[in-house]
């Protein structure tokens, strides 16, 4: 199963950690996809390493673990984020996070 904070908030100009936790006694994670709505943010593959989409490469840093650190947030970053865990032999598991970017006080 996937466990995640469903709603998180952060300040404009700040940073936030997007994190999904996968727990299984038997399945092994082979790949994790991160998307902002339908747009690819990053891919982690056991066989390939991390790939961050070039449009986000100056603001998205892999980690901690299989999560992402999203930096220099703007109001436009508000929205849904999805993690997709590809596991063997368990199949595919998805998680959703809603990020609200608030004006800095």
């Amino acid at each position: 199963t996937i466990d995640t904070k469903r709603n998180i908030s952060a300040e404009e100009g700040g940073s936030v950690i997007l994190q999904c936790h996968f727990s299984s006694d038997t399945a092994e994670v082979t790949q994790v996809d991160w998307k902002q709505q339908d747009q690819l943010l990053a891919i982690y593959s056991v066989d390939l390493g991390w790939h961050v989409a070039s449009v986000f490469s100056d603001r998205v840093v892999p980690g901690p673990s299989l999560g992402l650190t999203f930096q220099s947030l703007t109001m436009n970053d508000t929205g849904e984020y999805f993690c997709t865990y590809h596991t063997y032999p368990g199949g595919i598991y998805k998680g959703r996070i809603f990020l609200k970017v608030q004006e800095s006080s």
Partner: antibody
Framework: EVQLVESGGGVVQPGRSLRLSCAAS????????MHWVRQAPGKGLEWVAV????????LYADSVKGRFTISRDNSKNTLYLQMNSLRAEDTALYYC????????????WGQGTMVTVSS | DIQLTQSPSSVSASVGDRVTITCRAS??????LAWYQQKPGKAPKLLIY???SLQSGVPSRFSGSGSGTDFTLTISSLQPEDFATYYC?????????FGGGTKVEIK
């Protein structure tokens, strides 16, 4: 014996296209990520592209993105690289390569096929 | 992209010498580093993966070490067949990147 054999290289004018092939044998081709790596004459190695075992995903170096397409036919044990809008800087020896699973390193390489882009 | 800087770019050595080549990454890559040997007109040959794991069939005189940003390939006792160019490659991030190479020449 595990083997990769590239073909399809040649001399081509700038702006034209070329398709490289890589015939695989001696291993379960459809179970492996496959890579293309190139080497300009007298220069170092440059990773070009990778394709997932089932062909579902593909990733490219920025230098070839939008011009090159990696593909595979697992029924024919063959990897391809379609190269469009070729430039002089694409002149290189092109290798296909197979990784050691989960090691992120390439243990089997073909002999390479030479692509020369020149007017 | 992660830059890999190899040093020296070339080294002259004699048979029996201990040769050390370093590879520095522009940011941390954990232990995701491989080393290759390439001879003129030939494809690269994998020597080391995971910074320190010896590839099957590679002589034990080759060894690798390091993690994070600094890595080393050592040839404990150089043999005639070891004169070649050596490349490091990182695989923490795609695109995978290679160092510029180190040419090991006969003194």
């Amino acid at each position: 014996e595990v083997q990769l054999v590239e073909s399809g290289g040649g001399v081509v004018q700038p702006g034209r296209s070329l398709r490289l092939s890589c015939a695989a044998s001696g291993f379960t081709f459809g179970s492996y990520y496959m890579h293309w790596v190139r080497q300009a004459p007298g220069k170092g190695l440059e990773w070009v592209a990778v394709i997932w075992p089932d062909g579902s995903n593909k990733l490219y170096a920025d230098s070839v993105k939008g011009r090159f397409t990696i593909s595979r036919d697992n029924s024919k044990n063959t990897l391809y690289l379609q190269m469009n809008s070729l430039r002089a800087e694409d002149t290189a020896l092109y290798y296909c390569a197979k990784p050691v699973p989960k090691s992120r390193a390439l243990d089997v390489w073909g002999q390479g096929t030479m692509v020369t882009v020149s007017s | 992209d992660i830059q890999l800087t190899q040093s020296p770019s070339s080294v002259s050595a004699s048979v029996g010498d201990r040769v050390t080549i370093t590879c520095r990454a522009s940011q941390g890559i954990s232990s995701w580093l491989a080393w290759y040997q390439q001879k003129p007109g030939k494809a690269p040959k994998l020597l080391i993966y995971g910074a320190s794991s010896l590839q099957s069939g590679v002589p034990s005189r080759f060894s690798g070490s390091g993690s994070g940003t600094d890595f080393t390939l050592t040839i404990s006792s150089l043999q005639p067949e070891d004169f070649a160019t050596y490349y490091c490659q990182q695989a923490f991030y795609l695109p995978w990147t290679f160092g510029g190479g180190t040419k090991v020449e006969i003194k």
